[in-house]
């Protein structure tokens, strides 16, 4: 899921041929290409499915495209949390899950997607105007977040064509540190191949326990997805707004995705891929911050107020979460 | 510190309706679910449902749908229950109580109200 | 809705030793479950969540353990100011408080 970059092998310099000091910008270089490559703006994406067996049942996956790791996933309905939405759900990679009814089963996918299901029980399912919104707060890009709702008419079964959606707000203070960073190693970079312009290229052979040397590989974001960091909040359809849940009424409908990415360049794969993609057992993550694998065990499924806690051996699980929401 | 105060006790005729305040400080009043709860004399306690302060939203028990009614005013942090139609069954102490979210259920209550129904 | 059966309905301990109550849901409720303890007058204190996580600031006295339906909660060193009536609460599936155990000291 993650834009990474291969560079290929280095072979050392011959003795007395550059010495230290050549060893050291020759790596440095390459190093920096590295950084600018995998450097791009994060990624939010949301899929939101009303599920054909059960008419007023809603799954909602989320994603976040970034280098950083994620220490906070918040899903609201009804627009973004702070800005008259509703939290539904909480997820922390070690303090683990709370969630509120409608949410049935919220859960991580992988270590950097989640999924929620919400239940349609009559009086308090969801509608398909409903919008839902993900939040992703990571170190170091700060906090993205982006909204999805199904969208007006769709063919039953069919995957509703990725759009940009917007990446409602980011918290600069942890990105413009890093980009800076990041910024001043390109144009230094740029600088550095400049003045080895006209000197002979350094040396490279691939590497030698593999037959082939590896390939950079870097995707850069489209105009659309530049263009997506520019766009206001969704307007929310207050039709079907989740004020009372209690009177919000069921919604049938066929089973359907909307798929929003908030970046073109990466879009998610549709159900049919994620049946073959590989997924860590469910409520499995790896803990990237401490490096431990950490098996979260069950994640069951919810209606109400949910909390996965660890304070078994299984994994760290401190408590003191940092949100007052459930 | 995180504070929920309540508002005094209270009696009232049958027929009747309440509203009952909680006002809470020492957080960020918007992004804590509000539940409330009820004990009669005696007895033990009831989840009587939840509103979200953010937007609005409410969820109840079923058995307390159409007696009691959830708000809250954001700009004054606080969150209320209106009990319609009081009859000696309301005869009860009424508790709010913040979800803590990753911090637990029910991290921090009120000091309760007292109602007393009668005629 | 789920059902939480709560048991003793009261109970009488010597002060230093050790009391257990139990809680019985009618399904299983995946470890979410919370205890607290109310003393009159005053609004609940939440002891422990998640079966075994103790709330921050509660003395180590207190503890839970438990999985699927049957759940445990002990208090060990039993002290007077430990009298009072506590609770346990599912919240897997919407939230449910048991009927409470009333400790008195002997």
């Known amino acids: 899921m993650r834009t990474e970059a291969q560079v290929p092998a280095l072979q050392p310099p011959e003795p007395g041929l550059e010495g230290a000091m050549g060893h050291r910008t020759l790596v440095l270089p390459w190093v920096l290409l590295t950084l600018c490559v995998t450097a791009g703006t994060p990624e939010v994406w949301v899929q939101v499915r009303m599920e054909a067996t059960e008419l007023s049942s809603f799954t909602i996956r989320c994603g976040f495209l970034g280098s950083g790791s994620i220490s906070l996933v918040t899903v609201s309905w009804g627009g973004p949390n702070g800005a008259g939405g509703t939290t539904l759900a909480v997820l922390h990679p070690e303090r683990g899950i709370r969630q509120w009814a409608p949410a049935r089963q919220a859960r991580w996918e992988t270590q950097s997607s989640i999924s929620l299901i919400l239940e349609g029980s009559g009086a308090s399912s969801p509608c398909a105007n409903t919008t839902f919104c993900c939040k992703f707060a990571s170190f170091p890009e700060g906090s993205w977040e982006a909204c999805g709702s199904l969208p007006p008419s769709s063919d039953p079964g069919l995957s509703a064509p990725p759009t940009p959606a917007p990446i409602l707000r980011a918290d600069l203070a942890g990105i413009l540190g890093v980009s800076g960073v990041l910024l001043f190693g390109c144009v230094y970079l740029l600088h550095l191949l400049r003045r080895h312009k006209h000197r002979p290229a350094p040396r490279l052979q691939p590497s030698r326990t593999s037959p082939q040397a590896p390939r950079a590989r870097a995707w850069a974001p489209s105009q659309a997805s530049q263009a997506a960091l520019h766009v206001p909040y969704a307007t929310i359809n207050t039709s079907c707004r989740p004020a009372t849940l209690d009177t919000a009424h069921p919604h049938g409908g066929p089973s359907w995705w909307a798929s929003l990415p908030t970046h073109a360049a990466h879009r998610p794969q549709g159900p049919a891929a994620w049946a073959s993609t590989p997924i860590p057992a469910r409520g499995s993550f790896v803990s990237v911050e401490n490096g431990l694998y950490a098996q979260a065990g069950e994640r069951p499924p919810h209606t109400g107020p949910g909390l996965t806690l660890f304070p078994d051996p299984r994994g760290p699980r401190a408590m003191e979460g940092p949100l007052g929401v459930r | 510190q995180v504070q929920l105060q309540q508002s005094g006790p209270e009696l009232m005729k049958p027929g009747a309706s309440l509203k009952i305040s909680c006002k809470a400080s020492g957080y960020t009043f918007t992004d804590s679910y509000i539940n409330w709860v009820k004990q009669r004399p005696g007895q033990g306690l009831e989840w009587i449902g939840w509103?979200?302060?953010?937007?609005?939203?409410?969820y109840y028990n079923e058995k307390f749908k159409g007696t009691a009614t959830l708000t809250v005013d954001k700009s004054s942090s606080t969150a209320y229950m209106l009990l319609s139609s009081l009859t000696s069954e309301d005869s009860a102490a009424y508790f709010c109580?913040?979800?803590?979210?990753?911090?637990?259920?029910?991290?921090?209550w009120g000091q309760g109200t007292t109602l007393t129904v009668s005629s | 809705d789920i059902q939480m059966t709560q048991s003793p309905s009261s109970l009488s301990a010597s002060l230093g030793g050790k009391v257990t109550i139990t809680c019985k849901a009618s399904?299983?409720?995946?470890?979410?479950i919370a205890w607290y303890q109310h003393k009159p007058g005053k609004g609940p204190r939440l002891l422990i969540h998640y079966t075994s996580t103790l709330q921050s600031g509660i003395p180590s006295r207190f503890s839970g353990s438990g999985s699927g339906r049957d759940y445990f909660f002990s208090i060990s060193n039993l002290e007077s100011e430990d009298i009072a009536t506590y609770y346990c609460l599912q919240y897997d599936h919407l939230l449910t408080f048991g009927g409470g155990t009333k400790l008195e000291i002997k």
């Open positions: 509103i979200f302060p953010g937007s609005g939203s409410t």
């Open positions: 399904q299983d409720i995946n470890k979410y």
């Open positions: 109580a913040r979800d803590g979210g990753l911090r637990g259920p029910f991290d921090y």
